[in-house]
């Protein structure tokens, strides 16, 4: 049995944000279908996305079982009408993905400023602790619960009337900063994992300014 009409997948790429993890590949199938397998270094391969014509497979359910493990996926190609067909080595044609360690590599999603509250010359800025798809004891963990102190937030803030930015950092989800009385400020935050070598920073959050809905002012 041959696979003369079948081509191996290529450009296998992990797309992952806050642990939502999808494997993408090429080419768009012509008379062929794909099945994906994923494994940790244990070699216990688990099949997903059986005989699909998609060129992506959501592997979130597998990687969230242990985000600190390193995973490898492989994409098998089969002729559309004969999924039992094997290649010259007696097994279906397949290609391996790069290795992927979710804890070290998942992109940090764009954070959101949940609220800010001014009390005199202090402003407390709170970053929303986004829920991830990582579970523990049946409940979904937040980004902070997964990363702990490995995750910091950087706050950029500036007077609405000027462009000079100041920064503050926190390893919680709250900032307490000093501001000038009577001035309105704008805020943006960024998630950072300093210990990482790749994907260290998220994109900046949308800018929120004092005098808008999210804020609260108290003398």
């Amino acid at each position: 049995s041959g696979t003369t009409n079948t081509v191996a997948a290529y450009n296998l790429t992990w797309k992952s944000t806050n642990f939502k993890t999808i494997l993408e590949w090429e080419p768009k199938p012509v008379n062929q279908v794909y099945t994906v397998q994923i494994s940790t270094k244990s070699g216990d391969w688990k099949s997903k996305c059986f005989y699909t014509t998609d060129t992506e497979c959501d592997l979130t359910d597998e990687i969230v079982k242990d985000v600190k493990q390193t995973y490898l996926a492989r994409v098998f190609s089969y002729p559309a009408g004969n999924v039992e067909s094997t290649g010259s080595a007696g097994e279906p044609l397949y290609e391996n993905s790069p290795e992927f360690t979710p804890y070290l590599e998942t992109n940090l999603g764009q954070p959101t400023i949940q609220s800010f509250e001014q009390v005199g010359t202090k402003v407390n800025v709170t970053v929303e602790d986004e829920r991830t798809l990582v579970r523990k004891n049946g409940t979904f963990l937040t980004l902070r619960q997964v990363f702990g102190k490995d995750l910091i937030y950087t706050l950029y803030y500036w007077k609405s009337s000027s462009s000079g930015k100041k920064t503050a950092k926190t390893n919680t989800n709250e900032f307490l900063i000093d501001v000038d009385k009577g001035e309105n400020y704008c805020f943006s935050v960024q998630a950072v994992i300093p210990s990482r070598t790749v994907n260290r920073k998220s994109t900046d959050s949308p800018v929120e300014c004092m005098g808008q809905e999210k804020g609260e002012f108290r003398e």
Epitope: K41, S42, D44
Partner: antibody, heavy 118, light 106 residues
Framework: EVQLLESGGGLVQPGGSLRLSCAAS????????MGWVRQAPGKGLEWVST????????YYADSVKGRFTISRDNSKNTLYLQMNSLRAEDTAVYYC???????????WGKGTTVTVSS | DIQMTQSPSTLSASVGDRVTITCRAS??????LAWYQQKPGKAPKLLIY???SLESGVPSRFSGSGSGTEFTLTISSLQPDDFATYYC????????FGGGTKVEIK
């Protein structure tokens, strides 16, 4: 320190059986596939068998299929190779190896010698 | 099965030499290739995996390259400790080793 220590080798007659063991330490045993590789005297390396971390997947070289059985006991951090119907050509040093994904071998034991002779 | 052919089978070289060993696969194995070093009476030692990834603790004078069917292991400046036999291994389809290349003192 990651260590693998093979045992169970020896002299056996053709048609006989032998069980090799490999004691692992220094890593989470069940997190890794493991394998056996052999080397006949003066020859190159030959892959024999691989087993996944759970023990649920096993693979064999054609030369040993049906005669050898790989297994593991994760509670004892030990890998096994049951060798039956041994032949003269099975004479070799048998190495146990840690095998991420069951693909390549990143840690090897020192080896145990199996001699099949009458 | 995928066959792996190494050349040369023996290589004579001197300390300080740049040494290149070739491994050819009978069909494309992408980058799924490892290189090992073995000294007499000792177990093999992993040097390179995924064709070009250097194993932790291996000196940087060792490097691997290639993809598809042709691969090379290069030792940029041969050291006394490097005289040994080197094996390639494919893991695209099950596992097969090359026949080995013995690097000996010229």
């Amino acid at each position: 320190e990651v260590q693998l220590l093979e045992s169970g080798g020896g002299l056996v007659q053709p048609g006989g059986s032998l069980r090799l063991s490999c004691a692992a330490s220094g890593f989470t045993f069940s997190d890794y596939a493991m394998g056996w590789v052999r080397q006949a005297p003066g020859k190159g390396l030959e892959w024999v068998s691989t087993i996944s971390g759970s023990g649920g997947l096993t693979y064999y070289a054609d030369s040993v299929k049906g005669r050898f059985t790989i297994s593991r006991d994760n509670s004892k951090n030990t890998l096994y190779l049951q060798m039956n119907s041994l032949r003269a050509e099975d004479t070799a040093v048998y190495y146990c190896a840690k095998a991420p994904y069951g693909y390549y071998m990143d840690v090897w034991g020192k080896g145990t010698t199996v001699t099949v002779s009458s | 099965d995928i066959q792996m052919t190494q050349s040369p089978s023996t290589l004579s070289a001197s300390v300080g030499d740049r040494v290149t060993i070739t491994c050819r696969a009978s069909q494309s194995i992408s980058s799924w290739l490892a290189w090992y070093q073995q000294k007499p009476g000792k177990a093999p030692k992993l040097l390179i995996y995924k064709a070009s990834s250097l194993e932790s603790g291996v000196p940087s004078r060792f490097s691997g390259s290639g993809s598809g069917t042709e691969f090379t292991l290069t030792i940029s400046s041969l050291q006394p400790d490097d005289f040994a036999t080197y094996y390639c291994q494919q893991y695209k389809s099950y596992i097969t080793f090359g026949g080995g290349t013995k690097v000996e003192i010229k």
